[in-house]
Amino acid sequence: EPPTACREKQYLINSQCCSLCQPGQKLVSDCTEFTETECLPCSESEFLDTWNRETRCHQHKYCDPNLGLRVQQKGTSETDTICTCEEGLHCMSESCESCVPHRSCLPGFGVKQIATGVSDTICEPCPVGFFSNVSSAFEKCRPWTSCETKDLVVQQAGTNKTDVVCGPQDRQR
């Protein structure tokens, strides 16, 4: 790391080290030989999250309901607002600027992991012995019916999309 001219939490201006403004405050005027750095708190709708020499605070993120967003955590003078998605929606990207509906798992696929506000539904193919006959964002693959436990026999084999069909055992004459 290259050498620095100032202490931590200071910056160099006019060949002098001045204190940075603390998080939640913006720079009004640089220090001089006789005066300290002048800082002012950010307004209610603004923030700065680091020791800084910014002359303007950043605007809090707006969670636009038209994009499916709602406030998860209200911003402070030191932190930005955190948005999340409304029920049934998840973020399109890491920055969560808009939301999209959770996808459904098609017949033949079941839900491996239910969607959250930040992640989409994860589907998995139904393995042998399991099926899903619906398009759903919640349903897992269900096991085929066990005909034997009902004293029945398989009349039609199951698939990944259909359950087995059970029927009575043929009686021997």
């Epitope: 050498p3 060949s15 204190s19 030989e33």
Partner: antibody
């Protein structure tokens, strides 16, 4: 009372490394930068760099970049200075020195050394 | 880097004399200057900081003045224990730099 106690004298061969320790007592170790200053025989004082014991942040003089490492162990209130690839002109007394308190300084770096270690003589000779 | 030039490099004086040492910075350093006293085999001892503030426990015969590039350390009435080497140090920006030292010797 504030005390900085350094490790004992060292004799090293050129190309070797040396690690000098500085144990602080009598004050809050993490509340003050620790600097290292050296003095070659019959010569003046030369600043080497600082460590912030609270954050572990360091700042080294350009001359020593890549050769010096300053570390600390807050559990035993001790700062360390390691100098690598020693040369004969590194023969000097090495001092640790305590700066003004963190947050004391608003303009300038205002690094003034009110307490010093007793010094550690490092001799580099083949 | 800021160069600190001290003069004279040595001065011979008698007990009771007034001694003045000057220190010049290669660029303005406001009032960010310290003075140290060092005796043979010992670590330096802080006398004055921010150009003119006397460190606690330092006798009032020591005084400092100046700002910008030119600074002065004055010993108003030299005492036997004052025979030592004196260093100035700029504390405006890193790297910190010291003057070459002024040795105050007995005449």
């Amino acid at each position: 009372q504030v005390q900085l106690v350094q490790s004992g004298a060292e004799v090293k061969k050129p190309g070797a490394s040396v690690k000098v320790s500085c144990k602080a007592s009598g004050y809050t170790f993490t509340g003050y930068y620790m600097h290292w200053v050296r003095q070659a025989p019959g010569q003046g004082l030369e600043w080497m760099g600082w460590i912030n014991p609270d954050s572990g942040g360091t700042n080294y003089a350009q001359k020593f970049q890549g050769r010096v490492t300053m570390t600390r162990d807050t559990s035993i209130s001790t700062a360390y200075m390691e100098l690598n690839r020693l040369r004969s002109d590194d023969t000097a007394v090495y001092y640790c020195a305590r700066d003004q308190p963190l947050g004391y300084c608003t303009n300038g770096v205002c690094s003034y050394f009110d307490y010093w270690g007793q010094g550690t003589l490092v001799t580099v000779s083949s | 880097d800021i160069q600190m030039t001290q003069s004279p490099s040595s001065v011979s004086a008698s007990v009771g004399d007034r001694v003045t040492i000057t220190c010049r910075a290669s660029q303005g350093i406001y009032s960010w200057l310290a003075w140290y006293q060092q005796k043979p085999g010992k670590a330096p001892n802080l006398l004055i900081y921010t150009a003119s503030t006397l460190q606690s426990g330092v006798p009032s015969r020591f005084s400092g003045s100046g700002s910008g590039t030119d600074f002065t350390l004055t010993i108003s009435s030299l005492q036997p224990e004052d025979f030592a080497t004196y260093y100035c140090q700029q504390a405006n920006i890193f790297p910190l730099t010291f003057g070459g030292g002024t040795k105050v010797e007995i005449k």
